[in-house]
């Protein structure tokens, strides 16, 4: 699927002061979709500022966002999911800045969950499994997952594996023996829909066993 630019590329706003970004989540609550927007600058005074979406909606011309602290939020079934919507920051009914956005290009999946790692002694490997709510969804069903793992003592030395299934095998020989590992996973849309990485799943921690020497073999 060709998609031009990076996943989740967003238009620069007309007024830098009010530049914002948004992400959509489809079927996030039953058949309801959501759209979340926030200002890029956390110091923007959001008093009296409103968000509105118009176009590519079912049965209505426009919808207003609800404000939850510093984010703006809509939950609705009324997204047409084809065509571009115009999302505007407004004050007193006057638009300050707007962006044309196709909601199918700013999809942020829900975070994977139930991550676990099981060691198979006979196979000398670790089977990593996790779950995703998207297996039950009707729109964003196909995801690419990013499994990241590291030795706990290596602060920033994450290893990454991309996969489309929810099961991964890590060979024991590729891991350090008698070490504590941290592992986590996130997801991104991978068929037609485009957008952003999900939040990371909660981390899972596992320890690798010591090297089992064969009889007669000496430790180095």
């Amino acid at each position: 699927e060709s998609g031009y630019a990076q996943n989740g590329d967003l238009e620069d706003a007309e007024l830098d002061d009010y530049s914002f970004s948004c992400y959509s989540q489809l079927e996030v609550n039953g058949s309801q979709h959501s759209l979340t927007c926030a200002f890029e600058d956390p110091d923007v005074n959001t008093t009296n500022l409103e968000f509105e979406i118009c176009g590519a909606l079912v049965e209505v011309k426009c919808l207003s966002f609800r404000k939850l602290q510093e984010i703006y939020f809509i939950e609705t079934k009324k997204f047409l999911l084809i065509g571009k919507s115009n999302i505007c920051v407004k004050v007193g009914g006057k638009s300050l800045t707007c962006k044309k956005i196709d909601l199918t290009t700013i999809v942020k999946p829900e975070a994977p969950f139930d991550l676990s790692v099981i060691y198979r002694e006979g196979a000398n490997d670790f089977v990593v499994t996790f779950n995703t709510s998207h297996l039950q969804k009707k729109y964003v069903k196909v995801l690419m997952h990013d499994v990241a793992y590291r030795q706990e003592k290596d602060e920033n030395k994450w290893m990454h594996v991309n996969l489309s299934s929810t099961k991964l095998t890590l060979l024991q020989r590729n891991l350090q023996p008698e070490a504590m590992y941290e592992i986590k996973v996130r997801s991104i849309p991978d068929h037609y829909f485009k957008g952003f990485w999900s939040e990371w799943s909660p981390s899972y921690y596992f320890r690798t066993p010591e090297i089992n020497n064969s009889p007669g073999e000496m430790d180095p």
């Epitope: 699927e1 060709s2 031009y4 990076q6 084809i82 065509g83 044309k100 729109y139």
Partner: antibody, heavy 118, light 111 residues
């Protein structure tokens, strides 16, 4: 009103290149992707590729990869389609079209006739 | 590539009568209720004109005698009451997968 105005007809020899322009007006240029679709005489429509004017990112039909280049000039709200190594089968009307959504075409240019003949 | 098969190739209909054009795709162009099928009208010497997007959404300014339906691999464009100005070639197009392909066209004439 929203308009796409294309450059004039071209006659080219086999092996040459042609560069067709498409000037957009009546809307914010960076809001919509622009695509190129061609139509050989008496034939149907064939999508060639498109460009995102905001980023310059392109998507090409594999059939034309290596022969087609799409570029844009945001200062003049113009996109360009260059097709190289022309052959007689490239004789067609070339249309630029705005993508109202992924990926259908809600506004079309008037078309540019490119004739490839020795 | 997704192959688009339009039928019939040509169609002659009396003024005021219904015209129906079909488009079948070699694989599904739907994701649940999102149908990535679009219809265009092209008159001689003119560029195509968008009529219907997303299988059933009427483009702004298009008369409501035009309608679209279908899902999966089978789609239909209907002109409920043919007018003289509807004489044209009609094309379907899918946008679920690159390259975005068009049907071969259906020529509609007055009987």
């Amino acid at each position: 009103q929203v308009q796409l105005v294309q450059s004039g007809a071209e006659v080219k020899k086999p092996g040459a290149s042609v560069k067709v322009s498409c000037k957009a007006s009546g809307y914010r240029f960076t809001d919509y992707e622009l695509h190129w679709v061609r139509q050989a005489p008496g034939q149907g429509l064939e999508w060639m590729g498109g460009i995102d004017p905001k980023t310059g990112g392109t998507a090409y039909n594999q059939k034309f990869k290596g022969r087609v280049t799409m570029t844009r000039d945001t200062s003049t709200s113009t996109v360009y389609m260059e097709l190289s190594s022309l052959r007689s089968e490239d004789t067609a009307v070339y249309y630029c079209a705005r993508s109202g959504g992924r990926w259908y075409f809600d506004v079309w240019g008037q078309g540019t006739t490119v004739t490839v003949s020795s | 590539d997704i192959v688009m098969t339009q039928s019939p190739d040509s169609l002659a209909v009396s003024l005021g009568e219904r015209a129906t054009i079909n488009c079948r795709t070699s694989e599904s162009v739907s994701i649940h209720l999102l149908h990535l099928m679009h219809w265009y009208q092209q008159k001689p010497g003119q560029p195509p004109k968008l009529l219907i997007y997303g299988a059933s959404n009427l483009e702004s300014g298009v008369p409501d005698r035009f309608s679209g339906s279908g899902s999966g691999t089978d789609f239909t464009l209907t002109i409920s009451s043919l007018q003289a100005e509807d004489v044209a070639v009609y094309y379907c197009q899918q946008s679920i997968k690159d390259p975005y392909t068009f049907g071969g066209g259906t020529k509609v004439e007055i009987k």
